[in-house]
């Protein structure tokens, strides 16, 4: 069986440039170690935004300088991407890999279109 990954079609970042979405996967096996990667696709270019490997039941740990944070609950991963600007608008794809135990499985979501609108600067007050 292939692994199905679901994520919302569209998310709007808040005024502080933070966007959150859930990445849910249907696990064909009993994984104990899972890797989650967020990819950004724009103009046919794909870049890795962030990645984290976690043990089931434990917290996701992204690198210290990562713009992502997240929590896991069962087969759901709640992802938050921070520091987004209008130029970061694009399709954010959730990739899930069941790393252990064998066999390895990979699943890729259809992507979440994240829209980021830069806030208007506050007018000077006299």
């Amino acid at each position: 069986k292939a692994m199905h990954v679901a994520q919302p079609a569209v998310v709007l970042a808040n005024s502080r440039g933070t966007a959150s979405f859930v990445c849910e996967y249907a696990s064909p096996g009993k994984a104990t170690e899972v890797r989650v990667t967020v990819l950004r696709q724009a103009d046919s270019q794909v870049t890795e935004v962030c990645a984290a490997t976690y043990m089931m039941g434990n917290e996701l740990t992204f690198l210290d300088d990562s713009i992502c944070t997240g929590t896991s609950s069962g087969n759901q991963v709640n992802l938050t991407i921070q520091g987004l600007r209008a130029m970061d608008t694009g399709l954010y794809i959730c990739k899930v890999e069941l790393m252990y135990p064998p066999p390895y499985y990979m699943g890729i979501g259809n992507g979440t279109q994240i829209y980021v609108i830069d806030p208007e600067p506050c007018p000077d007050s006299d």
């Epitope: 292939a2 790393m99 499985y105 699943g107």
Partner: antibody, heavy 118, light 108 residues
Framework: QVQLVESGGGVVQPGRSLRISCAAS????????IHWVRQAPGKGLQWVAV????????YYADSVKGRFTISRDNSKNTLYLQMNSLRAEDTAVYYC???????????WGQGTMVTVSS | EIVLTQSPGTLSLSPGDRATLSCRAS???????LAWYQQKPGQAPRLLIY???SRATGIPDRFSGSGSGTDFTLTISRLEPEDFAVYYC?????????SGPGTKVDIK
């Protein structure tokens, strides 16, 4: 540019050992899984092994399990395949290949020939 | 493991012809994770199609992939001289990663 270059192939007697290498450049090596795929003369492609990211997770084809060991040195951007107890049927061109962002094998080396013969 | 079967074994065509190559999987479920590769004599394989239907970077639009479930197709709309080669399908969604035996496209 993004590339993989294999080395270390040669002629070896049955039962002996050989280690082949794959040097990567042009991309963040530690962010990708890397595979060994082989092709016997005149035959199709056969996946051999993969090693993921930090090197902790490795998978092997049944035909090489217990005889071959895949490893990587992320500080040197290099992949290895240690082949022990070699058999005539291991004779093939060995390719290293990158598991791309979407999983398919998007970058391939030129291959290194391993011949097992007495 | 997922077994992939390709047909025909050899396809004899002329430049300008349309080529249709088939790949069948022994079980469904890996439709999103099927790739096609081209290999010419003495060269490494080259990724053409991933995800059953997405063209890899730099691949001409005469190459297209389709299919789902267990049946997949690679179509070359108009064969160019450089397209005569062996084509392999592969599933990469689960280990062990498996390939078909290949289809050779040669000049009639």
């Amino acid at each position: 540019q993004v590339q993989l270059v294999e080395s270390g192939g040669g002629v070896v007697q049955p039962g002996r050992s050989l280690r082949i290498s794959c040097a990567a450049s042009g991309f963040t090596f530690s962010s990708y899984g890397i595979h060994w795929v082989r092709q016997a003369p005149g035959k199709g492609l056969q996946w051999v092994a993969v090693i993921w990211y930090d090197g902790r997770n490795k998978y092997y084809a049944d035909s090489v399990k217990g005889r071959f060991t895949i490893s990587r040195d992320n500080s040197k951007n290099t992949l290895y395949l240690q082949m022990n107890s070699l058999r005539a049927e291991d004779t093939a061109v060995y390719y290293c290949s990158r598991s791309g962002s979407f999983g398919a094998f998007d970058i391939w080396g030129q291959g290194t020939m391993v011949t097992v013969s007495s | 493991e997922i077994v992939l079967t390709q047909s025909p074994g050899t396809l004899s065509l002329s430049p300008g012809d349309r080529a249709t190559l088939s790949c069948r999987a022994s079980q469904s479920g890996s439709s999103s994770y099927l790739a096609w590769y081209q290999q010419k004599p003495g060269q490494a394989p080259r990724l053409l199609i991933y995800g059953a239907s997405s063209r890899a970077t730099g691949i001409p639009d005469r190459f297209s992939g389709s299919g789902s479930g267990t049946d997949f197709t690679l179509t070359i709309s108009r064969l160019e001289p450089e397209d005569f080669a062996v084509y392999y399908c592969q599933q990469y969604g689960t280990s062990p990663f498996t390939s078909g035996p290949g289809t050779k496209v040669d000049i009639k």
